[in-house]
């Protein structure tokens, strides 16, 4: 017998979708071989309809796909917009269609149940609203209007124009009789329940002259939308529940083994601690729709998620919901990068951020996750160089090492920098990742003087001491600007007003400014790196003043206050100045650090080569 397994019989109705899961032994060969879905013809041949190599037959174009999950030993065939022509015998299999590694599947697509003539069909999701239209003749205009539900051979009164309301429909049903001349009455049922499903009968008048109209109400629990995302990546659940619940509290919950639904996040401020630092509920639009972003996906995040609306912020019967089944693919295209980066107070961290390597031109961003209420993520830095003012002189985003990774360096660390940060781009949103910065005990490895005052026209020498463990690293000094950190030329690159000389024996790298000019004022970083991978940095501020007889040696620059208006991560990312907008709600305005204009364009930079789950910054 074949080791491939799947559903032997699949039945559905026209217009529906099916998702057929086939199982195979997850050997190395099986995991990587071709997967296919084919239809058996009268001749016995099996014609491929869709395969894992990207082939889709013309009959299936735009309505079918095949997704392989090699780590689980499964693949899934999704087919939408079913018609009765899709009924037939199929095979799901591995390798070549004519070989034995396959499983027979029978698909039957029917028209749906037989209904009385002239029956109007209403198909509505649970929790939503239906309006049943009931026509009548002029002579029945003054007579009683009613809606009955057919249960077996009997009819149960649901509502009538004499103010009767069946207790099962209390507070969620109304009968509307229009003004004269309109020969139709309507019955509106809100917050539909699964139990409302069935055949209804509208009636106007009585006796042999009464008007009747059948209505078939199909209340559907929303079929979970299948969502396949990569381990370590990001998923966005877009939830549109309708205007009726625009002002009601919203939630996302996950169905547990007891078949209840645990709140993951809601607009009342509740959040599951398992999602700390990696979830945002984005503000809702006027139509009540909202989205939830989860980053740093883990295998244990798999499951069925529901979004909904209810004043309690949790699942209640008869309120609208939307459903997703999330699968997390362990054979991820998103590379491993540290989820925790450690630094010491006064020291620095260099964070590696992955992005889709096919999108090297995309704008890169780094934001600080804030957990208050629904969560938000104000942008701190972006690849175009705009930086929040309070990070002036200590934060830089570098395009290096490139090819799917950029680097963010943050120095002058304090305990307040501990927290969760998100790496993102204005491209593929699935590549959003989360990193946690932890501040640990210890001393910075690089030692520089406190802030320095230089005198115009004189020579300034700033030492940077480094320990032996960095002797094989490249050392550099650079001048920070809001567009990066411009490396200063070393002595052997020819004469320069600012040059670096290094005495390896004294484990010292010095910055010399000779002569000091007004343009030299600003932040300087001393750092170490290995190729394009950056290690620790230390920052020093150089203030420039006129020659005078007496004066203070050190100057501390005034720190800028926090920008009152700041850009905030929402469900999409856009370029500044409204170019290539994906989601116009992304940011509010932001005060940015003005570029001093004294730097050559571009920057050279890179990141720590650690590939473990924890990446160190400065350590003891």
């Amino acid at each position: 017998k074949s080791p491939v397994f799947g559903p032997q019989e699949v039945s559905s109705v026209e217009g529906n979708s099916v998702s057929i899961k086939c199982y195979y032994p997850p050997t190395s060969v099986n995991r990587h071989t071709r997967k296919y879905w084919c239809r058996k013809g009268a001749s016995g041949r099996c014609i491929t309809l869709v395969s894992s190599e990207g082939y889709v037959s013309s009959n299936y174009a735009g309505r079918a796909n095949l997704t392989n999950f090699p780590e689980n030993g499964t693949f899934v065939v999704n087919i939408a917009q079913l018609s009765r022509d899709d009924s037939g015998h199929y095979k799901c299999g591995l390798g070549i269609n004519s070989r034995g590694l396959s499983f027979d599947v029978s698909l039957e697509v029917s028209q749906g149940p037989e209904l009385p003539n002239g029956t109007e069909v209403y198909t509505v999701d649970v929790g939503r609203t239906v309006t049943i239209k009931c026509p009548f003749k002029t002579e029945n205009a003054p007579k009683t209007k009613a809606l009955y539900k057919k249960i077996g051979q009997t009819s149960v009164l649901v509502i009538d124009s004499r103010n009767y309301v069946n207790p099962n429909y209390k507070d969620r049903i109304r009968l509307r009789i229009p003004g004269t001349g309109q020969l139709i009455f309507t019955v509106v049922i809100d917050r539909l329940r699964l139990s409302d499903h069935g055949l209804y009968l509208c009636q106007a008048g009585d006796g042999s002259n009464r008007d009747e109209k059948n209505a078939d109400l199909q209340v559907l629990e929303p079929e979970p939308e299948l969502v396949y995302e990569d381990l370590r990546g990001s998923v966005t659940f877009h939830c549109a529940l309708g205007l009726e619940v625009a002002n009601v509290a919203k939630f996302l919950c996950r169905v547990n083994s007891r078949e209840t639904c645990d709140v993951v996040i809601n607009t009342l401020g509740k959040r599951d601690s398992a999602f700390e630092g990696r979830i945002l509920l984005n503000p809702q639009d006027k139509d009540g729709s909202f989205s939830v972003v989860i980053t740093g996906l883990r295998k244990e995040d798999e499951g069925r998620y529901l979004c909904g609306a209810h004043s309690d912020g949790q699942l209640q019967e008869g309120w609208p919901i939307q459903a997703w089944q999330l699968f997390v693919n362990e054979e991820s295209t998103i590379p491993r990068s540290p989820t925790v980066v450690k630094g010491v107070a006064g020291g620095s961290v260099a964070v590696l951020c992955p992005y889709n390597p096919k999108e090297s031109q995309s704008l890169k961003y780094w934001c600080l996750w804030e957990g208050a209420q629904n969560g938000r993520c104000p942008l701190l830095v972006e690849s175009q160089g705009l930086v929040q003012e309070q990070y002036e002189g200590r934060l830089s985003l570098l395009q290096e090492p490139g090819n799917g990774t950029f680097t963010v360096i943050l120095n002058q660390l304090t305990t307040q920098d501990a927290g969760f940060y998100w790496c993102l781009t204005n491209g593929d949103t699935r590549w959003r990742t989360t990193v946690e910065i932890k501040i640990i005990e210890g001393e910075p490895n690089l030692k520089v003087p406190g802030n320095v005052t230089a005198v115009l026209g004189e020579t300034l020498n700033i030492p940077c001491h480094f320990p032996c463990k960095f002797s094989s690293y490249e050392k550099y000094w650079c001048k920070w600007s809001n567009t990066g950190c411009q490396t200063l030329p070393s002595q052997d690159e020819g004469p320069s007003e600012a040059f670096v000389n290094c005495d390896e024996n004294s484990r010292l790298v010095s910055l010399t400014l000779n002569p000091v000019t007004r343009a030299d004022e600003g932040w300087y970083w001393c750092g170490v790196k290995q190729g394009h991978f950056y290690g620790e940095t230390a920052a020093v501020y150089v203030a420039v003043e006129e020659k005078k007889v007496a004066g203070s040696r050190y100057v501390s620059p005034a720190k800028a206050d926090a920008a009152p208006d700041e850009k905030v991560l929402d469900s999409g990312v856009r370029e500044i100045e409204n170019k290539a907008i994906q989601d116009p709600r992304l940011f509010a305005e932001e005060k940015v650090v003005a570029d001093t204009g004294d730097q050559a364009g571009g920057s050279r930079a890179s990141v720590d080569s650690s590939s473990s789950e924890e990446q160190g910054g400065s350590s003891k």
Epitope: P7, Y23, N72, V255, E259
Partner: nanobody
Framework: QVQLVESGGGLVQAGDSLRLSCAAS????????MGWFRQPPGKEREFVAT??????????YYADSVKGRFTISRDNAKNTVYLQMNSLKPEDTAVYYC?????????????????WGQGTQVTVSS
Amino acid sequence: QVQLVESGGGLVQAGDSLRLSCAASGRTFTTYVMGWFRQPPGKEREFVATISWSGSTTYKYYADSVKGRFTISRDNAKNTVYLQMNSLKPEDTAVYYCAASTVVADPRAPNEYDYWGQGTQVTVSS
């Protein structure tokens, strides 16, 4: 919690038929997957058949050993799943268990199911 109660087991001759029922109650959320497993005397519990549904789409899975002889079906209105067993063989003798879950990764794996009935004995004599 979900309660599952099996019925319909008994003693029959080889070649006869039996129909097992599994009634589900107490659900707070729609169950999408219900299955039948069996445990022959002195052996491990094994997969027999599973039915899962989503809206008006139904998926039926069968073990090779029962294909063509057993049919799984459901009655939504009664919250009941049935196993129609035809052409019974002595090797079908076992305690038959009903199982249910919201989502299962592999319908053949007993550990994927969250709820189980007490079981009903089916004995097929030759």
